[in-house]
Protein backbone atom coordinates (compact mmCIF):
# COMPACT_ATOMS: atom_id res chain seq x y z
CA UNK A 1 0.00 0.00 0.00
CA UNK A 2 3.28 3.67 1.24
CA UNK A 3 6.60 3.34 1.12
CA UNK A 4 6.22 7.04 1.34
CA UNK A 5 6.23 8.38 4.83
CA UNK A 6 2.93 10.13 4.52
CA UNK A 7 1.01 7.46 2.73
CA UNK A 8 -2.37 6.65 4.07
CA UNK A 9 -4.40 3.84 2.63
CA UNK A 10 -2.21 0.89 2.06
CA UNK A 11 -4.33 -1.33 -0.04
CA UNK A 12 -5.35 -1.11 -3.62
CA UNK A 13 -8.38 -1.58 -5.76
CA UNK A 14 -9.51 -3.16 -8.95
CA UNK A 15 -9.30 -0.05 -11.05
CA UNK A 16 -6.82 2.57 -12.18
CA UNK A 17 -5.15 3.03 -8.87
CA UNK A 18 -3.98 -0.48 -8.26
CA UNK A 19 -1.04 0.91 -6.37
CA UNK A 20 -1.28 4.63 -6.87
CA UNK A 21 -1.82 6.21 -3.50
CA UNK A 22 -4.24 8.74 -4.78
CA UNK A 23 -7.85 9.59 -4.12
CA UNK A 24 -10.43 7.59 -5.97
CA UNK A 25 -13.47 8.27 -3.92
CA UNK A 26 -15.87 5.47 -4.58
CA UNK A 27 -14.04 2.27 -5.11
CA UNK A 28 -13.88 -1.23 -3.89
CA UNK A 29 -10.49 -1.38 -2.26
CA UNK A 30 -8.28 1.55 -1.64
CA UNK A 31 -4.90 3.12 -1.88
CA UNK A 32 -3.32 6.24 -0.54
CA UNK A 33 -6.28 8.37 0.32
CA UNK A 34 -9.58 7.69 1.99
CA UNK A 35 -11.82 5.73 -0.24
CA UNK A 36 -15.25 4.31 0.40
CA UNK A 37 -15.33 0.57 0.03
CA UNK A 38 -18.37 0.50 -2.23
CA UNK A 39 -18.75 0.81 -5.94
CA UNK A 40 -20.26 3.86 -7.61
CA UNK A 41 -24.02 4.02 -7.31
CA UNK A 42 -24.54 2.72 -10.83
CA UNK A 43 -22.91 -0.42 -9.57
CA UNK A 44 -20.17 -0.81 -12.13
CA UNK A 45 -16.44 -0.49 -12.21
CA UNK A 46 -14.56 1.72 -14.67
CA UNK A 47 -12.48 -0.22 -17.14
CA UNK A 48 -8.92 0.03 -15.91
CA UNK A 49 -6.05 1.66 -17.78
CA UNK A 50 -3.84 -1.04 -19.35
CA UNK A 51 -0.55 0.65 -18.44
CA UNK A 52 -1.19 0.60 -14.72
CA UNK A 53 -0.60 -3.12 -14.24
CA UNK A 54 2.80 -2.96 -15.96
CA UNK A 55 3.93 -0.06 -13.79
CA UNK A 56 2.50 -1.66 -10.65
CA UNK A 57 4.15 -5.00 -11.29
CA UNK A 58 7.56 -3.49 -12.02
CA UNK A 59 7.29 -1.21 -9.00
CA UNK A 60 6.50 -4.07 -6.63
CA UNK A 61 9.92 -5.65 -7.08
CA UNK A 62 11.93 -2.47 -7.64
CA UNK A 63 10.44 -0.93 -4.51
CA UNK A 64 11.13 -4.06 -2.47
CA UNK A 65 14.82 -3.97 -3.41
CA UNK A 66 15.01 -0.21 -2.75
CA UNK A 67 13.16 -0.55 0.59
CA UNK A 68 15.51 -3.32 1.75
CA UNK A 69 18.53 -1.22 0.76
CA UNK A 70 17.10 1.81 2.58
CA UNK A 71 16.40 -0.39 5.62
CA UNK A 72 20.03 -1.56 5.84
CA UNK A 73 21.65 1.79 4.97
CA UNK A 74 19.19 3.73 7.13
CA UNK A 75 19.58 1.48 10.13
CA UNK A 76 23.40 1.39 9.96
CA UNK A 77 23.78 5.05 9.02
CA UNK A 78 21.38 6.57 11.54
CA UNK A 79 22.43 4.24 14.36
CA UNK A 80 26.09 5.07 13.69
CA UNK A 81 25.30 8.78 13.61
CA UNK A 82 23.55 8.54 16.98
CA UNK A 83 26.45 6.54 18.40
CA UNK A 84 29.00 9.10 17.18
CA UNK A 85 27.14 11.99 18.81
CA UNK A 86 26.47 10.04 22.01
CA UNK A 87 30.00 8.66 22.44
CA UNK A 88 32.01 11.76 21.57
CA UNK A 89 31.80 14.55 24.10
CA UNK A 90 33.13 17.02 21.55
CA UNK A 91 30.18 16.16 19.31
CA UNK A 92 27.56 16.90 21.94
CA UNK A 93 26.40 20.38 21.05
CA UNK A 94 23.36 22.28 19.76
CA UNK A 95 23.40 21.54 16.03
CA UNK A 96 24.53 17.95 16.53
CA UNK A 97 21.76 17.35 19.06
CA UNK A 98 19.28 18.45 16.40
CA UNK A 99 21.00 16.16 13.88
CA UNK A 100 20.75 13.30 16.39
CA UNK A 101 17.04 14.08 16.79
CA UNK A 102 16.70 13.96 12.99
CA UNK A 103 18.53 10.63 12.86
CA UNK A 104 16.41 9.10 15.62
CA UNK A 105 13.20 10.09 13.82
CA UNK A 106 14.51 8.50 10.62
CA UNK A 107 15.67 5.39 12.49
CA UNK A 108 12.24 4.84 14.03
CA UNK A 109 10.65 5.06 10.59
CA UNK A 110 13.22 2.77 8.97
CA UNK A 111 13.08 0.09 11.68
CA UNK A 112 9.31 -0.04 12.22
CA UNK A 113 7.54 1.26 9.12
CA UNK A 114 9.71 -0.07 6.29
CA UNK A 115 9.37 -3.77 7.20
CA UNK A 116 5.57 -3.36 7.45
CA UNK A 117 5.58 -1.67 4.09
CA UNK A 118 7.67 -4.37 2.41
CA UNK A 119 5.35 -7.04 3.83
CA UNK A 120 2.33 -5.14 2.51
CA UNK A 121 3.95 -4.77 -0.88
CA UNK A 122 4.90 -8.44 -1.27
CA UNK A 123 1.98 -10.12 0.48
CA UNK A 124 -0.60 -7.71 -0.91
CA UNK A 125 -2.33 -7.57 2.46
CA UNK A 126 -1.96 -5.87 5.79
CA UNK A 127 0.12 -7.82 8.35
CA UNK A 128 -1.96 -9.56 11.05
CA UNK A 129 -5.08 -8.28 9.27
CA UNK A 130 -7.40 -10.60 11.19
CA UNK A 131 -6.36 -9.83 14.76
CA UNK A 132 -5.92 -6.92 17.16
CA UNK A 133 -2.20 -6.59 16.52
CA UNK A 134 -3.04 -5.78 12.90
CA UNK A 135 -5.35 -3.00 14.12
CA UNK A 136 -2.54 -1.68 16.34
CA UNK A 137 -0.08 -1.73 13.43
CA UNK A 138 -2.69 -0.03 11.25
CA UNK A 139 -2.72 2.93 13.63
CA UNK A 140 0.99 2.83 14.45
CA UNK A 141 2.20 2.75 10.84
CA UNK A 142 0.73 6.07 9.59
CA UNK A 143 1.27 7.65 13.01
CA UNK A 144 5.01 6.93 12.84
CA UNK A 145 5.13 7.97 9.19
CA UNK A 146 3.71 11.39 10.01
CA UNK A 147 5.73 11.71 13.21
CA UNK A 148 8.94 10.88 11.41
CA UNK A 149 8.45 13.38 8.63
CA UNK A 150 7.29 15.96 11.21
CA UNK A 151 10.48 15.41 13.21
CA UNK A 152 12.54 15.81 10.02
CA UNK A 153 10.77 19.00 8.99
CA UNK A 154 10.83 20.66 12.42
CA UNK A 155 14.45 19.70 13.06
CA UNK A 156 15.46 21.27 9.75
CA UNK A 157 13.62 24.43 10.75
CA UNK A 158 15.35 24.39 14.15
CA UNK A 159 18.74 23.92 12.49
CA UNK A 160 18.09 26.92 10.24
CA UNK A 161 17.04 29.05 13.22
CA UNK A 162 20.07 27.78 15.14
CA UNK A 163 22.44 28.83 12.34
CA UNK A 164 20.95 32.30 12.33
CA UNK A 165 21.20 32.51 16.11
CA UNK A 166 24.82 31.37 15.98
CA UNK A 167 25.69 34.20 13.60
CA UNK A 168 23.52 36.83 15.29
CA UNK A 169 24.80 36.12 18.82
CA UNK A 170 28.51 36.67 18.32
CA UNK A 171 29.30 37.14 21.96
CA UNK A 172 27.63 33.93 23.08
CA UNK A 173 30.01 31.67 24.98
CA UNK A 174 29.21 28.03 24.96
CA UNK A 175 31.17 25.03 26.13
CA UNK A 176 30.69 21.37 25.36
CA UNK A 177 27.16 20.09 25.87
CA UNK A 178 23.68 20.63 24.63
CA UNK A 179 22.26 24.08 25.43
CA UNK A 180 19.02 24.12 27.39
CA UNK A 181 17.23 25.98 24.58
CA UNK A 182 18.18 23.20 22.12
CA UNK A 183 17.00 20.51 24.53
CA UNK A 184 13.68 22.33 24.90
CA UNK A 185 13.50 22.69 21.09
CA UNK A 186 14.04 18.94 20.59
CA UNK A 187 11.43 17.93 23.18
CA UNK A 188 8.98 20.43 21.63
CA UNK A 189 9.70 19.11 18.13
CA UNK A 190 8.92 15.54 19.15
CA UNK A 191 5.80 16.47 21.09
CA UNK A 192 4.48 18.63 18.24
CA UNK A 193 5.27 15.93 15.66
CA UNK A 194 3.35 13.36 17.68
CA UNK A 195 0.41 15.73 18.18
CA UNK A 196 0.22 16.48 14.44
CA UNK A 197 0.24 12.73 13.72
CA UNK A 198 -2.71 11.99 16.04
CA UNK A 199 -5.37 12.39 13.29
CA UNK A 200 -3.64 9.55 11.41
CA UNK A 201 -3.83 7.25 14.42
CA UNK A 202 -7.48 8.17 14.95
CA UNK A 203 -8.52 7.99 11.31
CA UNK A 204 -6.80 4.79 10.25
CA UNK A 205 -8.81 1.63 10.80
CA UNK A 206 -9.00 -1.90 9.45
CA UNK A 207 -11.85 -1.71 6.96
CA UNK A 208 -13.43 -4.91 5.67
CA UNK A 209 -14.11 -5.22 1.96
CA UNK A 210 -15.29 -7.93 -0.35
CA UNK A 211 -13.74 -9.10 -3.57
CA UNK A 212 -15.25 -11.93 -5.58
CA UNK A 213 -17.19 -13.11 -2.55
CA UNK A 214 -14.09 -13.26 -0.36
CA UNK A 215 -13.74 -11.08 2.71
CA UNK A 216 -10.58 -9.00 3.05
CA UNK A 217 -9.46 -6.27 5.41
CA UNK A 218 -7.30 -3.29 4.64
CA UNK A 219 -5.80 -0.48 6.67
CA UNK A 220 -7.12 2.84 5.46
CA UNK A 221 -8.12 6.33 6.47
CA UNK A 222 -11.83 6.19 7.17
CA UNK A 223 -13.43 9.49 8.12
CA UNK A 224 -16.17 9.01 10.69
CA UNK A 225 -16.31 12.51 12.19
CA UNK A 226 -16.65 16.01 10.76
CA UNK A 227 -13.06 16.81 11.71
CA UNK A 228 -11.74 13.66 10.01
CA UNK A 229 -13.74 14.46 6.89
CA UNK A 230 -12.20 17.92 6.87
CA UNK A 231 -8.73 16.43 7.49
CA UNK A 232 -9.29 14.01 4.62
CA UNK A 233 -10.25 16.84 2.26
CA UNK A 234 -7.38 19.17 3.08
CA UNK A 235 -4.77 16.48 3.75
CA UNK A 236 -2.77 16.76 0.51
CA UNK A 237 -2.57 20.55 0.79
CA UNK A 238 -1.73 20.38 4.50
CA UNK A 239 1.06 17.88 3.81
CA UNK A 240 2.41 20.03 1.01
CA UNK A 241 2.19 23.23 3.02
CA UNK A 242 3.43 22.15 6.44
CA UNK A 243 5.63 19.15 5.65
CA UNK A 244 7.28 20.59 2.55
CA UNK A 245 6.91 24.33 1.99
CA UNK A 246 7.28 25.33 5.64
CA UNK A 247 10.85 24.02 6.16
CA UNK A 248 11.94 25.53 2.84
CA UNK A 249 10.40 28.92 3.66
CA UNK A 250 11.89 28.76 7.14
CA UNK A 251 15.35 28.01 5.75
CA UNK A 252 15.02 30.74 3.14
CA UNK A 253 14.03 33.34 5.75
CA UNK A 254 16.69 32.50 8.32
CA UNK A 255 19.45 32.01 5.77
CA UNK A 256 18.61 35.38 4.23
CA UNK A 257 18.74 36.96 7.69
CA UNK A 258 22.01 35.16 8.38
CA UNK A 259 23.53 36.40 5.13
CA UNK A 260 22.44 39.96 5.94
CA UNK A 261 23.97 39.60 9.41
CA UNK A 262 27.25 38.39 7.98
CA UNK A 263 27.34 41.18 5.40
CA UNK A 264 26.62 43.79 8.09
CA UNK A 265 29.60 42.57 10.09
CA UNK A 266 32.04 42.46 7.19
CA UNK A 267 34.13 45.40 8.33
CA UNK A 268 36.07 46.17 11.48
CA UNK A 269 38.38 44.50 13.89
CA UNK A 270 35.67 42.08 15.07
CA UNK A 271 35.68 40.49 11.63
CA UNK A 272 39.41 39.89 11.83
CA UNK A 273 39.18 38.49 15.36
CA UNK A 274 36.35 36.18 14.40
CA UNK A 275 37.48 35.22 10.89
CA UNK A 276 38.10 31.57 11.81
CA UNK A 277 34.94 31.56 13.84
CA UNK A 278 32.98 32.91 10.87
CA UNK A 279 34.56 30.39 8.56
CA UNK A 280 33.57 27.44 10.68
CA UNK A 281 30.03 28.73 11.19
CA UNK A 282 29.73 29.22 7.46
CA UNK A 283 30.74 25.58 7.03
CA UNK A 284 28.11 24.42 9.49
CA UNK A 285 25.54 26.59 7.70
CA UNK A 286 26.51 24.92 4.41
CA UNK A 287 26.00 21.50 5.97
CA UNK A 288 22.54 22.41 7.26
CA UNK A 289 21.68 23.96 3.89
CA UNK A 290 22.81 20.75 2.21
CA UNK A 291 20.42 18.71 4.42
CA UNK A 292 17.54 21.05 3.52
CA UNK A 293 18.30 20.82 -0.21
CA UNK A 294 18.42 17.00 0.00
CA UNK A 295 15.08 17.04 1.84
CA UNK A 296 13.55 19.26 -0.87
CA UNK A 297 14.86 17.07 -3.71
CA UNK A 298 13.67 13.88 -2.02
CA UNK A 299 10.16 15.08 -1.29
CA UNK A 300 9.36 17.33 -4.25
CA UNK A 301 8.35 14.63 -6.79
CA UNK A 302 5.93 12.98 -4.37
CA UNK A 303 4.28 16.25 -3.35
CA UNK A 304 4.06 17.30 -6.99
CA UNK A 305 2.37 14.04 -8.00
CA UNK A 306 -0.08 14.43 -5.10
CA UNK A 307 -0.98 18.00 -6.07
CA UNK A 308 -1.28 17.10 -9.77
CA UNK A 309 -3.51 14.17 -8.82
CA UNK A 310 -5.67 16.50 -6.76
CA UNK A 311 -5.90 19.29 -9.33
CA UNK A 312 -5.41 17.87 -12.83
CA UNK A 313 -6.48 14.21 -12.82
CA UNK A 314 -10.12 13.42 -13.52
CA UNK A 315 -11.05 9.78 -12.96
CA UNK A 316 -14.10 10.11 -15.22
CA UNK A 317 -12.11 11.44 -18.20
CA UNK A 318 -11.91 8.87 -20.98
CA UNK A 319 -8.46 10.13 -21.96
CA UNK A 320 -7.09 9.90 -18.42
CA UNK A 321 -4.84 6.88 -19.01
CA UNK A 322 -1.80 8.76 -20.34
CA UNK A 323 -1.88 11.20 -17.44
CA UNK A 324 -2.43 8.29 -15.06
CA UNK A 325 0.66 6.48 -16.38
CA UNK A 326 2.71 9.63 -15.86
CA UNK A 327 1.31 10.19 -12.36
CA UNK A 328 1.83 6.55 -11.42
CA UNK A 329 5.44 6.65 -12.55
CA UNK A 330 6.01 9.97 -10.83
CA UNK A 331 4.34 8.71 -7.68
CA UNK A 332 6.53 5.63 -7.54
CA UNK A 333 9.68 7.65 -8.12
CA UNK A 334 8.48 10.10 -5.48
CA UNK A 335 7.73 7.32 -3.01
CA UNK A 336 11.22 5.89 -3.34
CA UNK A 337 12.92 9.28 -3.15
CA UNK A 338 10.89 10.27 -0.09
CA UNK A 339 11.73 6.99 1.62
CA UNK A 340 15.37 7.49 0.67
CA UNK A 341 15.39 10.71 2.67
CA UNK A 342 15.28 8.63 5.84
CA UNK A 343 18.66 7.08 5.10
CA UNK A 344 20.43 9.82 3.16
CA UNK A 345 21.30 12.29 5.96
CA UNK A 346 24.16 10.19 7.45
CA UNK A 347 25.54 9.76 3.91
CA UNK A 348 25.27 13.51 3.28
CA UNK A 349 27.05 14.28 6.56
CA UNK A 350 29.78 11.79 5.67
CA UNK A 351 30.54 13.68 2.46
CA UNK A 352 29.94 17.23 3.69
CA UNK A 353 31.54 17.07 7.14
CA UNK A 354 35.16 16.06 7.68
CA UNK A 355 34.49 15.54 11.37
CA UNK A 356 31.59 13.18 10.78
CA UNK A 357 33.50 11.41 7.98
CA UNK A 358 36.34 10.55 10.33
CA UNK A 359 33.99 9.45 13.07
CA UNK A 360 31.98 7.32 10.67
CA UNK A 361 35.12 5.64 9.38
CA UNK A 362 36.45 4.86 12.83
CA UNK A 363 33.03 3.89 14.21
CA UNK A 364 32.21 1.53 11.36
CA UNK A 365 35.66 -0.02 11.72
CA UNK A 366 34.73 -0.97 15.31
CA UNK A 367 34.06 2.09 17.43
CA UNK A 368 34.33 5.81 17.03
CA UNK A 369 37.39 6.61 19.06
CA UNK A 370 38.40 10.07 20.07
CA UNK A 371 42.04 10.31 19.17
CA UNK A 372 44.29 13.27 19.76
CA UNK A 373 44.84 13.69 16.04
CA UNK A 374 41.12 13.84 15.44
CA UNK A 375 40.74 16.62 17.96
CA UNK A 376 43.59 18.74 16.67
CA UNK A 377 44.64 17.97 13.13
CA UNK A 378 41.12 17.41 11.85
CA UNK A 379 39.20 20.35 13.21
CA UNK A 380 35.47 20.37 13.75
CA UNK A 381 34.85 23.52 11.82
CA UNK A 382 37.99 24.06 9.91
CA UNK A 383 39.85 25.26 13.01
CA UNK A 384 41.73 23.35 15.63
CA UNK A 385 40.40 23.53 19.13
CA UNK A 386 43.09 24.89 21.39
CA UNK A 387 42.03 24.78 24.99
CA UNK A 388 45.44 25.94 26.24
CA UNK A 389 45.13 29.39 24.74
CA UNK A 390 44.02 31.81 27.45
CA UNK A 391 43.61 34.83 25.26
CA UNK A 392 40.13 36.10 26.04
CA UNK A 393 39.04 36.57 22.45
CA UNK A 394 40.34 33.24 21.32
CA UNK A 395 38.95 31.56 24.37
CA UNK A 396 35.46 32.81 23.64
CA UNK A 397 35.78 31.99 19.99
CA UNK A 398 37.01 28.49 20.57
CA UNK A 399 34.53 27.63 23.28
CA UNK A 400 31.71 28.89 21.15
CA UNK A 401 32.98 26.83 18.27
CA UNK A 402 31.97 23.69 20.12
CA UNK A 403 28.42 24.58 19.36
CA UNK A 404 29.25 24.22 15.71
CA UNK A 405 31.34 21.08 15.68
CA UNK A 406 29.93 19.49 12.58
CA UNK A 407 32.53 19.97 9.90
Amino acid sequence: DNPERYSTNLSNHVDDFTTFRGTELSFLVTTHQPTNLVLPSNGSMHNYCPQQTKITSAFKYINTVISCTIFIVGMVGNATLLRIIYQNKCMRNGPNALIASLALGDLIYVVIDLPINVFKLLAGRWPFDHNDFGVFLCKLFPFLQKSSVGITVLNLCALSVDRYRAVASWSRVQGIGIPLVTAIEIVSIWILSFILAIPEAIGFVMVPFEYRGEQHKTCMLNATSKFMEFYQDVKDWWLFGFYFCMPLVCTAIFYTLMTCEMLNRRNGSLRIALSEHLKQRREVAKTVFCLVVIFALCWFPLHLSRILKKTVYNEMDKNRCELLSFLLLMDYIGINLATMNSCINPIALYFVSKKFKNCFQSCLCCCCYQSKSLMTSVPMNGTSIQWKNHDQNNHNTDRSSHKDSMN
Partner: antibody
Framework: EVQLQQPGGGLVQPGGSLTLSCATS????????MSWVRQTPAKRLELVAT????????NYPDSVKGRFTISRDNAKSTLYLQMRSLKSEDTAMYYC?????????WGQGTSVTVSS | DVLMTQTPLSLPVSLGDQASISCRSS???????????LEWYLQKPGQSPKLLIY???NRFSGVPNRFRGSGSGTDFTLKITRVEAEDLGIYYC?????????FGSGTKLEIK
Protein backbone atom coordinates in the same frame (compact mmCIF):
# COMPACT_ATOMS: atom_id res chain seq x y z
CA GLU B 1 -24.85 -31.06 -1.62
CA VAL B 2 -24.52 -27.70 -3.40
CA GLN B 3 -27.26 -27.21 -5.95
CA LEU B 4 -28.07 -24.33 -8.33
CA GLN B 5 -31.39 -24.85 -10.07
CA GLN B 6 -32.15 -22.87 -13.21
CA PRO B 7 -35.57 -23.18 -14.84
CA GLY B 8 -35.92 -23.54 -18.59
CA GLY B 9 -35.27 -20.45 -20.71
CA GLY B 10 -37.19 -19.25 -23.67
CA LEU B 11 -37.50 -17.45 -26.97
CA VAL B 12 -37.65 -13.64 -26.82
CA GLN B 13 -38.06 -11.05 -29.56
CA PRO B 14 -35.36 -8.38 -30.03
CA GLY B 15 -36.08 -5.45 -27.72
CA GLY B 16 -37.96 -7.72 -25.35
CA SER B 17 -37.30 -8.53 -21.69
CA LEU B 18 -36.71 -11.65 -19.68
CA THR B 19 -35.86 -12.42 -16.06
CA LEU B 20 -33.76 -15.46 -15.23
CA SER B 21 -33.70 -17.02 -11.78
CA CYS B 22 -31.34 -19.36 -9.97
CA ALA B 23 -32.59 -21.15 -6.85
CA THR B 24 -29.82 -22.44 -4.62
CA SER B 25 -29.45 -24.93 -1.78
CA UNK B 26 -26.80 -26.87 0.12
CA UNK B 27 -24.69 -23.88 1.13
CA UNK B 28 -24.98 -20.54 2.94
CA UNK B 29 -26.16 -18.39 0.05
CA UNK B 30 -25.58 -15.07 1.87
CA UNK B 31 -21.87 -15.91 2.33
CA UNK B 32 -21.18 -16.17 -1.39
CA UNK B 33 -20.86 -13.67 -4.16
CA MET B 34 -22.78 -14.72 -7.25
CA SER B 35 -22.27 -14.40 -11.00
CA TRP B 36 -24.03 -14.90 -14.28
CA VAL B 37 -21.97 -16.29 -17.15
CA ARG B 38 -23.22 -16.84 -20.65
CA GLN B 39 -21.98 -19.13 -23.42
CA THR B 40 -22.62 -18.20 -27.01
CA PRO B 41 -23.44 -20.79 -29.67
CA ALA B 42 -19.78 -20.46 -30.72
CA LYS B 43 -18.85 -21.75 -27.22
CA ARG B 44 -17.37 -18.43 -26.13
CA LEU B 45 -17.80 -17.76 -22.38
CA GLU B 46 -18.57 -14.27 -21.11
CA LEU B 47 -19.19 -13.09 -17.56
CA VAL B 48 -22.23 -10.80 -17.72
CA ALA B 49 -22.83 -9.80 -14.09
CA THR B 50 -21.50 -10.25 -10.57
CA UNK B 51 -23.05 -9.34 -7.25
CA UNK B 52 -21.59 -9.09 -3.75
CA UNK B 53 -22.75 -11.18 -0.79
CA UNK B 54 -25.15 -8.51 0.52
CA UNK B 55 -26.27 -7.36 -2.92
CA UNK B 56 -24.85 -3.84 -2.47
CA UNK B 57 -22.32 -4.10 -5.27
CA UNK B 58 -23.01 -5.23 -8.81
CA ASN B 59 -20.72 -5.17 -11.83
CA TYR B 60 -21.41 -5.47 -15.53
CA PRO B 61 -19.26 -5.45 -18.67
CA ASP B 62 -19.96 -2.70 -21.22
CA SER B 63 -21.78 -5.14 -23.50
CA VAL B 64 -24.74 -5.44 -21.09
CA LYS B 65 -24.37 -2.33 -18.92
CA GLY B 66 -27.67 -0.48 -18.59
CA ARG B 67 -29.67 -3.40 -19.99
CA PHE B 68 -29.06 -6.18 -17.48
CA THR B 69 -29.64 -6.04 -13.73
CA ILE B 70 -28.39 -8.66 -11.30
CA SER B 71 -30.11 -8.99 -7.92
CA ARG B 72 -30.43 -11.47 -5.11
CA ASP B 73 -32.83 -12.45 -2.37
CA ASN B 74 -30.79 -13.85 0.50
CA ALA B 75 -33.94 -14.87 2.38
CA LYS B 76 -35.00 -17.06 -0.54
CA SER B 77 -31.42 -18.04 -1.52
CA THR B 78 -32.24 -17.01 -5.06
CA LEU B 79 -30.30 -15.09 -7.70
CA TYR B 80 -31.93 -13.11 -10.52
CA LEU B 81 -30.89 -11.59 -13.82
CA GLN B 82 -33.28 -9.10 -15.35
CA MET B 83 -32.59 -8.63 -19.06
CA ARG B 84 -34.08 -5.72 -21.02
CA SER B 85 -33.67 -4.43 -24.59
CA LEU B 86 -32.49 -7.84 -25.69
CA LYS B 87 -30.45 -8.15 -28.88
CA SER B 88 -29.77 -11.12 -31.13
CA GLU B 89 -26.19 -11.25 -29.78
CA ASP B 90 -27.61 -11.97 -26.32
CA THR B 91 -28.61 -15.43 -27.58
CA ALA B 92 -26.71 -17.83 -25.34
CA MET B 93 -26.81 -20.39 -22.56
CA TYR B 94 -26.90 -18.50 -19.24
CA TYR B 95 -25.28 -20.05 -16.18
CA CYS B 96 -25.42 -18.89 -12.59
CA UNK B 97 -22.34 -19.54 -10.46
CA UNK B 98 -21.19 -19.11 -6.89
CA UNK B 99 -18.28 -16.73 -6.19
CA UNK B 100 -15.78 -17.28 -3.40
CA UNK B 101 -12.47 -16.29 -4.95
CA UNK B 102 -13.51 -18.37 -7.96
CA UNK B 103 -16.69 -19.65 -9.58
CA UNK B 104 -16.86 -22.91 -7.66
CA UNK B 105 -20.34 -24.19 -8.44
CA TRP B 106 -22.42 -23.70 -11.57
CA GLY B 107 -26.05 -24.17 -12.45
CA GLN B 108 -27.05 -26.42 -15.35
CA GLY B 109 -27.84 -23.39 -17.52
CA THR B 110 -30.81 -21.66 -19.08
CA SER B 111 -31.07 -21.29 -22.84
CA VAL B 112 -32.08 -17.85 -24.08
CA THR B 113 -32.80 -17.24 -27.75
CA VAL B 114 -33.37 -13.73 -29.05
CA SER B 115 -34.97 -13.90 -32.45
CA SER B 116 -37.80 -12.38 -34.42
CA ASP C 1 -10.18 -5.50 -21.42
CA VAL C 2 -7.64 -8.16 -20.49
CA LEU C 3 -7.30 -10.55 -23.42
CA MET C 4 -6.72 -14.18 -22.46
CA THR C 5 -4.97 -16.11 -25.22
CA GLN C 6 -5.07 -19.88 -24.98
CA THR C 7 -2.82 -22.25 -26.94
CA PRO C 8 -3.34 -24.63 -28.57
CA LEU C 9 -6.95 -24.39 -29.71
CA SER C 10 -7.05 -28.16 -30.04
CA LEU C 11 -4.89 -30.70 -28.24
CA PRO C 12 -5.03 -34.30 -29.44
CA VAL C 13 -3.57 -36.68 -26.82
CA SER C 14 -3.34 -40.37 -26.14
CA LEU C 15 -4.79 -41.65 -22.88
CA GLY C 16 -2.07 -41.78 -20.23
CA ASP C 17 -0.04 -39.01 -21.90
CA GLN C 18 0.75 -35.64 -20.36
CA ALA C 19 -1.15 -32.63 -21.69
CA SER C 20 -0.12 -29.03 -21.33
CA ILE C 21 -2.31 -26.01 -22.04
CA SER C 22 -0.94 -22.48 -22.06
CA CYS C 23 -2.76 -19.27 -21.23
CA ARG C 24 -1.31 -15.79 -21.66
CA SER C 25 -2.92 -12.58 -20.42
CA SER C 26 -2.43 -9.26 -22.19
CA UNK C 27 -1.72 -7.60 -18.83
CA UNK C 28 -0.30 -8.64 -15.49
CA UNK C 29 -3.19 -10.14 -13.53
CA UNK C 30 -1.88 -9.91 -10.00
CA UNK C 31 -4.68 -8.30 -8.02
CA UNK C 32 -4.03 -5.66 -5.38
CA UNK C 33 -5.05 -8.08 -2.62
CA UNK C 34 -1.91 -10.03 -3.52
CA UNK C 35 -3.91 -12.80 -5.21
CA UNK C 36 -3.67 -13.75 -8.84
CA UNK C 37 -7.21 -14.63 -9.80
CA LEU C 38 -6.41 -17.07 -12.59
CA GLU C 39 -8.72 -20.04 -12.89
CA TRP C 40 -9.06 -23.11 -15.09
CA TYR C 41 -12.48 -24.56 -15.98
CA LEU C 42 -13.35 -27.77 -17.77
CA GLN C 43 -16.54 -28.10 -19.76
CA LYS C 44 -17.42 -31.63 -20.75
CA PRO C 45 -19.85 -32.14 -23.67
CA GLY C 46 -23.42 -31.30 -22.68
CA GLN C 47 -22.44 -30.10 -19.19
CA SER C 48 -21.86 -26.77 -17.47
CA PRO C 49 -18.25 -25.68 -16.82
CA LYS C 50 -16.57 -27.02 -13.66
CA LEU C 51 -13.84 -25.32 -11.66
CA LEU C 52 -10.53 -27.20 -11.65
CA ILE C 53 -7.89 -24.72 -10.48
CA TYR C 54 -8.22 -21.37 -8.74
CA UNK C 55 -5.65 -18.68 -7.87
CA UNK C 56 -3.18 -20.15 -10.39
CA UNK C 57 -2.30 -23.40 -8.61
CA ASN C 58 -4.96 -24.38 -6.05
CA ARG C 59 -7.01 -27.46 -6.86
CA PHE C 60 -10.73 -27.17 -6.18
CA SER C 61 -12.32 -29.80 -3.93
CA GLY C 62 -12.72 -33.14 -5.64
CA VAL C 63 -10.26 -32.33 -8.43
CA PRO C 64 -7.70 -35.14 -8.95
CA ASN C 65 -4.05 -34.30 -8.27
CA ARG C 66 -3.09 -35.07 -11.85
CA PHE C 67 -4.24 -31.53 -12.62
CA ARG C 68 -1.56 -28.95 -11.88
CA GLY C 69 -1.68 -25.21 -12.43
CA SER C 70 1.36 -22.95 -12.53
CA GLY C 71 2.60 -19.59 -13.74
CA SER C 72 2.72 -15.96 -12.67
CA GLY C 73 2.22 -12.44 -13.99
CA THR C 74 1.01 -13.03 -17.54
CA ASP C 75 1.97 -16.64 -18.36
CA PHE C 76 0.06 -19.60 -16.99
CA THR C 77 -0.02 -23.33 -17.65
CA LEU C 78 -2.36 -26.20 -16.89
CA LYS C 79 -0.73 -29.63 -16.90
CA ILE C 80 -2.54 -32.95 -16.80
CA THR C 81 0.03 -35.61 -15.94
CA ARG C 82 -1.83 -38.72 -17.13
CA VAL C 83 -4.84 -37.95 -19.29
CA GLU C 84 -7.90 -40.09 -18.62
CA ALA C 85 -11.06 -40.41 -20.71
CA GLU C 86 -13.06 -38.30 -18.22
CA ASP C 87 -10.66 -35.38 -18.79
CA LEU C 88 -11.78 -34.81 -22.35
CA GLY C 89 -13.62 -31.58 -23.07
CA ILE C 90 -12.93 -27.87 -23.47
CA TYR C 91 -10.58 -26.18 -21.02
CA TYR C 92 -10.98 -22.47 -20.36
CA CYS C 93 -8.67 -20.15 -18.49
CA UNK C 94 -10.22 -17.13 -16.76
CA UNK C 95 -8.92 -13.98 -15.10
CA UNK C 96 -10.86 -12.38 -12.26
CA UNK C 97 -8.36 -9.71 -11.27
CA UNK C 98 -9.35 -6.85 -13.56
CA UNK C 99 -12.90 -6.05 -14.53
CA UNK C 100 -14.37 -6.97 -16.96
CA UNK C 101 -13.33 -10.51 -16.08
CA UNK C 102 -12.47 -12.52 -19.17
CA PHE C 103 -12.23 -16.11 -20.37
CA GLY C 104 -9.80 -17.61 -22.82
CA SER C 105 -11.17 -18.93 -26.11
CA GLY C 106 -10.83 -22.52 -24.94
CA THR C 107 -8.65 -25.54 -25.69
CA LYS C 108 -10.33 -28.73 -26.84
CA LEU C 109 -8.68 -31.80 -25.38
CA GLU C 110 -9.45 -34.78 -27.60
CA ILE C 111 -8.25 -38.31 -28.25
CA LYS C 112 -5.48 -38.59 -30.83
Amino acid sequence: EVQLQQPGGGLVQPGGSLTLSCATSGFTFSSYGMSWVRQTPAKRLELVATISTNGATANYPDSVKGRFTISRDNAKSTLYLQMRSLKSEDTAMYYCATEKGAMGYWGQGTSVTVSS
Amino acid sequence: DVLMTQTPLSLPVSLGDQASISCRSSQNIVHSTGNTYLEWYLQKPGQSPKLLIYKVSNRFSGVPNRFRGSGSGTDFTLKITRVEAEDLGIYYCFQGSHFPFTFGSGTKLEIK
